[in-house]
């Protein structure tokens, strides 16, 4: 015998109190799959969380973080404070990058400057707390008569992959 609840579509639930009739999910709840015996409570984006997508009868709300914070965890389960470029977030708060490291993001930790000499290149632009070193041509290319080399562009702010 087929379970009558299997006919209940997403956005409804199989109401045992009403002879297993498919009833719409109540306000502030949803069911994302068919055949559900209950609807799930919608996530509420409060405090440092803000609503990225409203809850509907068939899908949960999605949250992101208010300005000055960024998401961590699957589905943005946590908001973590941003720091300024040139800083990293430690357990004790934002702190400036140590000499020889940089951070061009508002999150993450300070990264060591590129060591141009490892690839046989020279330093064209010194690094700062906010920017990596820019490597120029190899010293051999700087000899008289060598063709000019266009320095690479500094790294743009990379995107953050969805977590």
């Amino acid at each position: 015998l087929q379970d009558p609840c299997s006919n209940c579509p997403a956005g409804t639930f199989c109401d045992n109190n009403r002879n297993q009739i498919c009833s719409p999910c109540p306000p502030n709840s949803f069911s994302s799959a068919g055949g559900q015996r209950t609807c799930d409570i919608c996530r509420q984006c409060k405090g440092v969380f803000r609503t990225r997508k409203e809850c509907s009868s068939t899908s949960n709300a999605e949250c992101d973080c208010t300005p000055g914070f960024h998401c961590l965890g699957a589905g943005c389960s946590m908001c973590e404070q941003d720091c300024k470029q040139g800083q990293e977030l430690t357990k004790k708060g934002c702190k400036d990058c140590c000499f020889g490291t940089f951070n061009d993001q508002k999150r993450g930790i300070c990264r060591p400057w590129t060591n141009c000499s490892l690839d046989g290149k020279s330093v064209l632009v010194n690094g700062t707390k906010e920017r990596d070193v820019v490597c120029g041509p190899s010293p051999a290319d700087l000899s008289p008569g060598a063709s000019s080399v266009t320095p690479p562009a500094p790294a743009r702010e990379p995107g953050h992959s969805p977590q």
């Epitope: 993450g108 930790i109 060591p112 590129t114 990596d132 953050h160 992959s161």
Partner: antibody
Framework: QVQLVQSGAEVKKPGASVKVSCKAS????????MHWVRQAPGQGLEWMGW????????NYAQKFQGRVTMTRDTSISTAYMELSRLRSDDTAVYYC?????????????WGQGTLVTVSS | YVLTQPPSVSVAPGETARITCGGD??????VHWYQKKPDQAPVLVVY???YRPSGIPERISGSNSGNTATLTLSRVEAGDEADYYC????????????FGGGTQLIIL
Amino acid sequence: QVQLVQSGAEVKKPGASVKVSCKASGYTFTGYYMHWVRQAPGQGLEWMGWINPNSGGTNYAQKFQGRVTMTRDTSISTAYMELSRLRSDDTAVYYCAREPGYYGSGLDYWGQGTLVTVSS
Amino acid sequence: YVLTQPPSVSVAPGETARITCGGDDIGDKRVHWYQKKPDQAPVLVVYEDRYRPSGIPERISGSNSGNTATLTLSRVEAGDEADYYCQVWDSSSDHPGVFGGGTQLIIL
């Protein structure tokens, strides 16, 4: 979806060089650092270095400095790792792995691995 | 910087497995955990001490304080049998990427 596809297995003689490629798709190649990690038979994971595909800037583990070169070709969204003066203990599976847009987090996408066998 | 893991941890199905990763003041660093199965690429299961990427089940969790980080797998299943590696970034050294030696999780 993000994908990292690596070149096929290689067999090399001691003293030779090998160049492994890693073709990226499903995201902006120049926006994310690429790392290389290897695993020798029966051993653990070992970090080799990274490249910034936008600037070409690199950082290599001291152990590999002078033997490893990481490069990229942005026109075909491909990163390369070349290891020279190969020894038998360089026999390993070599992986490329993407950093998730900022330094200090875990490596979120990995290539399938390339087995490099060094044998006389 | 050195990360120390036990070579193996054994657990019965349905029980809880705890895999440790030791390092000097590791609580001040962000620890990441990877699952590695034979002939497969590593998979990030926990990042920045305790956050799960999308698709990783809630029964996998992480914590980090003092000199020890811990990966916890509750209600362990046969499919969890794998090697697990902790990892940190150490910008102050000439070897920024550091992995632990790995722990083999054995399901009894």
